[in-house]
C-alpha cells in the first residue's frame, strides 16, 4: 500500500492543478432533477511555493501559537489554488431536456492572492 | 454567552477584512533575535458572498460527499481572503540594531480568486 504507486499519487496530488471527476448532476446543487453523471473539473493542490514574506511570517506565527485568529476564520498563509478560467457544463434532466449551465466547471487553475 | 455582544462579535469576525495583533518578533520566523513585540496585520474572514456558480456547485458536491478530493488537498469553494497591499515592519534586535523587513504586514485585504 505504501509502494511507488502511492508515492507517485501523493506527489501528483500535491501541486495546484486542474482535477476532473465524474459527479452526479443532482449533487451539483443546481435544482435540476437528473439521474446522470457528468465530468466536473475543479482546482486543488498546494500553493506553498508561491508564498510571500508575509505568508511565511503568518505561517510561523500560527505554528507558534502566537497569533489568535478570529473565531471560525483562520487566516490563509499561502495563495489559494483557484480557477482562472471556466467552461459550461451540459447535462440531461429527467425530462430528457438538455440543460447548459455557464461557467460551472474550471478549465485552468492558478495560485491566486 | 449567547447574548447580543457575542452575536455582534461573531458577525464582525465573519467577513474578509484586515486584522491586527501584537506579536513577538521572534515568532515571525525571520531569523532575527529580538525581545520586542510588533503590530502585525493580516487578513481573515469569509468570502462566501463572492462565490461563483462553480464555487456553489463545488461546495454542494463536497457537502454531499460526491467529490473525492486528492489526498491531503481539499479544494477551496470560495475566494480567499488575502492581502492586496503590504507594508514594512521595523523592530529592534537584541543588539539594539533597527531592522526593517519589507512587505511583511498587510495593509488591505480582498476576496481573491
Amino acid at each position: 500500500a505504501g509502494g511507488p504507486g502511492s508515492r507517485a499519487r501523493a506527489a501528483g496530488a500535491r501541486g495546484c492543478r486542474l482535477r476532473s471527476q465524474l459527479v452526479p448532476v443532482r449533487a451539483l446543487g443546481l435544482g435540476h432533477r437528473s439521474d446522470e453523471l457528468v465530468r466536473f473539473r475543479f482546482c486543488s493542490g498546494s500553493c506553498r511555493r508561491a508564498r510571500s514574506p508575509h505568508d511565511l511570517s503568518l505561517a510561523s506565527l500560527l505554528g507558534a501559537g502566537a497569533l489568535r485568529p478570529p473565531p471560525g476564520s483562520r487566516p490563509v498563509s499561502q495563495p489559494c489554488c483557484r480557477p482562472t478560467r471556466y467552461e459550461a457544463v451540459s447535462f440531461m434532466d429527467v425530462n430528457s431536456t438538455w440543460r447548459t449551465v455557464d461557467r460551472l466547471s474550471a478549465t485552468a487553475c492558478g495560485c491566486l492572492g | 454567552a449567547g447574548g447580543p455582544g457575542s452575536r455582534a462579535r461573531a458577525a464582525g469576525a465573519r467577513g474578509c477584512r484586515l486584522r491586527s495583533q501584537l506579536v513577538p518578533v521572534r515568532a515571525l520566523g525571520l531569523g532575527h533575535r529580538s525581545d520586542e513585540l510588533v503590530r502585525f496585520r493580516f487578513c481573515s474572514g469569509s468570502c462566501r458572498r463572492a462565490r461563483s456558480p462553480h464555487d456553489l456547485s463545488l461546495a454542494s458536491l463536497l457537502g454531499a460527499g460526491a467529490l473525492r478530493p486528492p489526498p491531503g488537498s481539499r479544494p477551496v469553494s470560495q475566494p480567499c481572503c488575502r492581502p492586496t497591499r503590504y507594508e514594512a515592519v521595523s523592530f529592534m534586535d537584541v543588539n539594539s540594531t533597527w531592522r526593517t523587513v519589507d512587505r511583511l504586514s498587510a495593509t488591505a485585504c480582498g476576496c481573491l480568486g
Epitope: 500500500a1 509502494g3 504507486g5 502511492s6 499519487r9 501528483g12 496530488a13 482535477r19 476532473s20 471527476q21 465524474l22 459527479v23 452526479p24 446522470e36 453523471l37 457528468v38 465530468r39 486543488s44 467552461e87 459550461a88 451540459s90 447535462f91 440531461m92 438538455w98 447548459t100 466547471s105 | 460527499g65 460526491a66 473525492r68 478530493p69 486528492p70
Partner: antibody, heavy 123, light 107 residues
Framework: QVQLVESGGGVVQPGRSLRLSCEAS????????LHWVRQAPGKGLEWVAF????????YYPKSVKGRFSISRDNSKNTLYLQMNSLRAEDTAVYHC????????????????WGQGTLVTVSS | DIQMTQSPSSLSASVGDRVTITCRAS??????LNWYQQKPGKAPKLLIY???GLQSGVPSRFSGRGSGTDFTLAISSLQPEDFATYYC?????????FGPGTKVDIK
C-alpha cells in the same frame, strides 16, 4: 505490469443470473475508477457499468439498469458484475477496464482492458 | 443519451497513406473524447485520450484533434499493423457512448 483477468462467463438461460469477476494486479486498485464494457459478436462496443474508486458512485445505462449491479472489493483487488434477469441481447464478451488516471484526475479514458469473458444467453 | 457517429464506416487504404477518421457527438462533450484501436479477437487498445493526448507506447503517427462536438483521428503514414477497427468514445456524460467504429482495411 497491469493485468485484468475476467472470469465467470458461460452459457445461461434467459431470466437466469451470472456473476462476473475481474482480478486486477500491477496497480494500486483503490486509486482508480473502473468500468465494464461489452461487445456482442460482430458488433461494436457498449459501456455497461461504472464504479468509483471507493465504491461510492455507480452508474448503468438504461439497457441494464435494475438488472446489473457493479461492485468492488478493494481488499481483494477484484471487480464484480452481478447480472440478473439475463436476456438474449446480453450475449457478449464482457471486458473489465480501468481508467487511465487517478480517481481525482479521472477523464474516462480506459487504458487497460481484460481479454474478456464470453456470456451466452440462450435457451 | 449522447449519440456518437463516425465516418466513414469503413475505408480501404495503402501503406504510407494519410488516413483521417471523423467522430461527431450529438451534444457538446468538451474535450472528453477518446480513440481506441481493436484488432480481431483482441481487446481494444487506447490510442488517444481527451481529444489529443497520445497514450504511452502509441506511435506518434497517430494524432487527435477537435473540440465540442467534432473530432478527428489522423494516421499520418499508415503502417501494416494499423489495419484494424477504430472506435471513438465520449466520457463526458453518462452513459459513456462509443461510436459504431471505422474499419480500416488494405486497398
Amino acid at each position: 505490469q497491469v493485468q485484468l483477468v475476467e472470469s465467470g462467463g458461460g452459457v445461461v438461460q434467459p431470466g437466469r443470473s451470472l456473476r462476473l469477476s475481474c482480478e486486477a494486479s500491477g496497480f494500486t486498485f483503490s486509486d482508480y475508477d473502473l468500468h465494464w464494457v461489452r461487445q456482442a459478436p460482430g458488433k461494436g462496443l457498449e459501456w455497461v457499468a461504472f464504479i468509483s474508486n471507493d465504491g461510492s458512485n455507480e452508474y448503468y445505462p438504461k439497457s441494464v439498469k435494475g438488472r446489473f449491479s457493479i461492485s468492488r472489493d478493494n481488499s481483494k483487488n477484484t471487480l464484480y458484475l452481478q447480472m440478473n434477469s439475463l436476456r438474449a441481447e446480453d450475449t457478449a464478451v464482457y471486458h473489465c477496464t480501468k481508467e487511465r488516471d487517478y480517481y481525482y484526475d479521472s477523464s474516462g479514458s480506459l487504458d487497460y482492458w481484460g481479454q474478456g469473458t464470453l456470456v451466452t444467453v440462450s435457451s | 443519451d449522447i449519440q456518437m457517429t463516425q465516418s466513414p464506416s469503413s475505408l480501404s487504404a495503402s501503406v504510407g497513406d494519410r488516413v483521417t477518421i471523423t467522430c461527431r457527438a450529438s451534444q457538446t462533450i468538451n474535450n472528453y473524447l477518446n480513440w481506441y484501436q481493436q484488432k480481431p479477437g483482441k481487446a481494444p487498445k487506447l490510442l488517444i485520450y481527451t481529444t489529443s493526448g497520445l497514450q504511452s507506447g502509441v506511435p506518434s503517427r497517430f494524432s487527435g484533434r477537435g473540440s465540442g462536438t467534432d473530432f478527428t483521428l489522423a494516421i499520418s503514414s499508415l503502417q501494416p499493423e494499423d489495419f484494424a477497427t477504430y472506435y471513438c468514445q465520449q466520457s463526458y456524460h453518462s452513459p459513456f457512448t462509443f461510436g459504431p467504429g471505422t474499419k480500416v482495411d488494405i486497398k
